[in-house]
Interface confidence: medium
């Protein structure tokens, strides 16, 4: 669906501003804070997403082991650069000339240095874990029904082709939801896996992006699935380049 | 737009098994779940059971045993049956929507149907 | 199973007035990860189906007029209509969400 005509909003973006202003009166919806035009039939970029957020007030059983070279956002929000696209740009610097090279999901994967730091092409994050513990209950829950709801979930909340979701593992009561997506495999129209994640990330907050949406009441057989802890890895097609003291530390 | 309708016999006889119908459009049964509640009369409401959009089904426990839900995609409906019925199961039936992640609210009802066991 | 339990059963208010009624749970409703309440609010107007008026406890549905209001959190939770008129006439139905579901046994409103 595109944004309602009725009452003129976005439903899968509350932080944007719309009016009947498009072609033919149409409802035509902005981001906030960059004030570019996003489609109310998708999920919008995470990169408008964080920049709308800073300017608002404000298969196996087994689980995985997150690769050596995986990213965990520790550097928390900032205030991003995107491109005309919305993705965001490859080098993020803030305002006192601080600058580091980031990833397709934002996360930042050098050193930070001055203005004079290079990153030549934004890195694709082509793989996500998504690690989460869910609250003590009665029992564990069945696999293959936690499988099926989150695969549909990402379906259908998220428009999430089913191919990108690469594995569902459990082992009470650690969840992890594996989603990839090569630069090759991501057709034009696809929801990127790391827009998808974002969207979850909040949702599981109960900070849901949807318009009129008050969280999300995952189920699983009837009985509510309630996330307490999340963590999300990224791993990137070109390994991070961080100095040997970030490493070590 | 969405909407639930349904359809039920109206008149049942005690200790025989009631079958009602709830057709919807608007949405799939693939992705949102359908409740079913009763209302006797002149009293509150009573929540019997769920299908929900996986094909899993929940029952109020105190039911279960006289209780099945099943439905039938493709043709867009949702069917209770409750057996061995008494004067007791009579009752506005009603069936509502799921609002599947968004909240288990029920933000989208059918009118009812009237259903009254007697001989 | 989770019991729900309204009160007053019935109440009776001049136009205007506030009405404010109860909805008690047997067991908490919090979410601990999301911080909401799995507890909604609904209207049934005679010879209609319920109407919800209120999601996790206090989110005023789309078109619900500001009069009403939800309130509480944990086992405690309370609807207010801070000035009742007439259209307002109706059993009110509180319903659990944590657990499967259950509805309270409800609270008319009726104008004295």
């Known amino acids: 669906h595109t944004a309602a005509q009725d009452n003129c909003t976005c439903p899968t973006n509350k932080m944007t501003v719309c009016s009947p202003d498009g072609p033919g009166g149409r409802c035509q919806c902005r981001a906030l804070g960059s004030g570019m035009a996003v489609d109310c039939s998708t999920l919008t970029s995470k990169c408008l997403l964080l920049k709308a957020r800073m300017s608002a007030p404000k298969n196996a059983r087994t689980l995985v082991r997150p690769s050596e070279h995986a990213l965990v956002d520790n550097d928390g929000l900032y205030d991003p650069d995107c491109d005309p696209e919305g993705r965001f740009k490859a080098r993020q610097c803030n305002q006192t000339s601080v600058c580091w090279c980031v990833n397709s999901v934002g996360v930042r994967r050098t050193d930070k240095g001055d203005l004079s730091l290079r990153c030549d092409e934004l890195v694709r994050t082509h793989h996500i874990l998504i690690d989460l513990r869910h609250r003590p209950t009665a029992g564990a829950f069945n696999h293959s029904d936690l499988d099926a709801e989150l695969r549909r979930l990402f379906r259908e909340r998220y428009r999430l082709h089913p191919k990108f979701v690469a594995a569902v593992h459990y082992e009470q009561p650690t969840i992890q939801i594996e989603l990839r997506q090569n630069t090759s495999q991501k057709a034009a129209g696809d929801v990127d896996i790391g827009d998808a994640a974002y969207y979850f990330e909040r949702d599981i907050k109960g900070e849901s992006l949807f318009q009129g949406r008050g969280g999300l009441d995952l189920r699983v057989r009837g009985e509510p699935l309630q996330v307490e802890r999340t963590l999300i890895y990224y791993l990137d097609e070109i390994p991070p380049k961080f100095s040997m003291k970030r490493l070590t530390a | 737009q969405v909407q639930l309708k349904e359809s039920g016999p109206g008149l049942v006889a005690p200790s025989e098994t009631l079958s009602i119908t709830c057709t919807v459009s608007g949405f799939s049964l693939t992705s949102y779940g359908v409740n079913w509640i009763r209302q006797p009369p002149g009293k509150g409401l009573e929540w019997l059971g769920v299908m929900w959009a996986g094909g899993s089904t929940n029952y109020n426990s105190a039911l279960m045993s006289r209780l099945t839900i099943s439905k039938d995609t493709s043709k867009n409906q949702v069917s209770l049956k409750l057996s061995s019925v008494q004067a007791a199961d009579t009752a506005m039936y009603y069936c509502a929507r799921d609002e599947n992640w968004d909240g288990a609210w029920f933000a989208y009802w059918g009118q009812g149907t009237l259903v009254t066991v007697s001989s | 199973d989770i019991v729900m339990t309204q009160s007053p059963s019935s109440l009776a208010v001049s136009l205007g007035e506030r009405a404010t009624m109860s909805c008690k749970s047997s067991?908490?409703?919090?979410?601990?990860?999301?911080?909401?309440?799995?507890l909604a609010w609904y209207q049934q107007k005679p010879g209609q189906p319920p109407k919800l008026l209120i999601s996790w406890a206090s989110s005023r549905e789309s078109g619900v007029p500001d009069r009403f209001s939800g309130s509480g959190s944990g086992t405690d939770f309370t609807l207010t209509i801070s000035s009742v008129q007439a259209e307002d006439l109706a059993v009110y139905y509180c319903?659990?969400?944590?657990?499967?579901?259950?509805f309270g046994g409800g609270t008319k409103v009726e104008i004295k």
């Open positions: 319903k659990q969400s944590y657990n499967l579901f259950t």
């Open positions: 067991q908490s409703l919090l979410n601990s990860g999301t911080r909401k309440n799995y």
